[in-house]
């Protein structure tokens, strides 16, 4: 087959990729599976550190950080004085808040 991707439909904005006599779908962010029809699991790799609770979210994932940690992946400890290890805390976020 000269055109492995002929008639091949990749859903949800995925792109068909040819190679080695086979074809596969390169899926858009947030999707997976053979035809990109499955919602990808953004929490599969346990991205939330230090006991953070991971939720799939329309924007990808969100971490609910355990008390004492902050950051998009709960990676930054909050110091006892309330300051964080971040150079500057993102505006509008409190220590322990879930982070996008």
């Amino acid at each position: 087959d000269l055109d492995d991707c002929a008639g091949r439909a990749c859903a949800n904005g995925g792109t068909c990729v040819e190679g080695g006599g086979a074809h596969r779908c390169s899926c858009a962010l947030g999707f997976g599976g053979r035809d990109c029809r499955e919602r990808a699991d953004p929490c599969a790799a346990r991205p939330c550190a230090h006991g953070g609770r991971c939720y799939a979210h329309f924007s990808g994932l969100v971490c609910a950080c355990a008390p004492g940690y902050m950051g998009a992946r709960c990676e930054f400890p909050v110091h006892p004085d309330g300051a964080s290890a971040l150079p500057a805390a993102p505006p509008g976020l409190r220590p322990g808040d879930p982070q996008r």
């Epitope: 699991d41 929490c43 790799a45 991971c54 609910a64 879930p98």
Partner: antibody, heavy 123, light 111 residues
Framework: QEQLVESGGGLVQPEGSLTLTCTAS?????????MCWVRQAPGKGLEWIAC????????TDYANWAKGRFSISKTSSTTVTLQMTSLTVADTATYFC???????????????WGPGTLVTVSS | QVLTQTPSPVSAAVGGTVTISCQAS????????LAWYQQKPGQPPKLLIY???SLASGVPSRFKGSGAGTQFTLTISDLECDDAATYYC????????????FGGGTEVVVK
């Protein structure tokens, strides 16, 4: 339409075991936060038991009193089970399956519930 | 952690107002991770309020949640017969792991 339905309840002898199943329709667990079990003894209040991540990580949380005797697991993208062992009369209750979603920086928001399944522990 | 609800039961006439209190033995997660549920006999609970004061989808504005930390209140105004139910508060905590606790429930009687 999003729905949860529990099954597997019934009469069980003290010290017996039982496995409850929660089946979802209209959505898949992987995109829906956590799936949880809550129980309610006849005429009593609600009691949280456990939650499991809807995704593939399988992360779980248990009430302290449930650790050891209760085990939550995800058997497919639309089914969650609760295995209960060493049951006593005090475990007699309606067992609800509920979906826990993240809303506005808060968690453990149970915005979808099943109708419940009754477990009676009696000799 | 214990969530203590008072009073129970509470009664008021149609069109009246009832206030239910929920006292936590320690602060809930982020000081606002508290929800309120309504339950009628033979039915599962229904989420009314999340984040202490935010109305869940489809819930009328007659229901109002307030409070932070350890002290929370649910107020139901312009009472309707359909509001007769048991109401539960639910707090979320973290202590070497996540967990959740429900209050004992408050029965609302509409006269």
């Amino acid at each position: 339409q999003e729905q949860l339905v529990e099954s597997g309840g019934g009469l069980v002898q003290p010290e017996g075991s039982l496995t409850l199943t929660c089946t979802a329709s209209g959505f898949s667990f992987s995109s829906s936060g956590y799936m949880c079990w809550v129980r309610q003894a006849p005429g009593k209040g609600l009691e949280w038991i456990a939650c499991i991540s809807g995704g593939s990580s399988g992360d779980t949380d248990y009430a302290n009193w449930a650790k050891g005797r209760f085990s939550i697991s995800k058997t497919s993208s639309t089914t969650v089970t609760l295995q209960m062992t060493s049951l006593t009369v005090a475990d007699t209750a309606t067992y609800f399956c509920a979906r826990d979603v993240y809303i506005d920086s808060t968690i453990f928001n149970f915005n979808l519930w099943g109708p419940g399944t009754l477990v009676t522990v009696s000799s | 952690q214990v969530l203590t609800q008072t009073p129970s039961p509470v009664s008021a006439a149609v069109g009246g107002t009832v206030t239910i209190s929920c006292q936590a033995s320690q602060s809930v997660y982020n000081n606002n991770n508290l929800a309120w549920y309504q339950q009628k006999p033979g039915q599962p609970p229904k989420l009314l309020i999340y984040a202490a004061s935010s109305l869940a989808s489809g819930v009328p504005s007659r229901f109002k949640g307030s409070g932070a930390g350890t002290q929370f209140t649910l107020t139901i105004s312009d009472l309707e017969c359909d509001d007769a139910a048991t109401y539960y508060c639910q707090g979320t905590y973290y202590s070497s792991g996540w967990y959740s606790t429900f209050g004992g429930g408050t029965e609302v009687v509409v006269k």
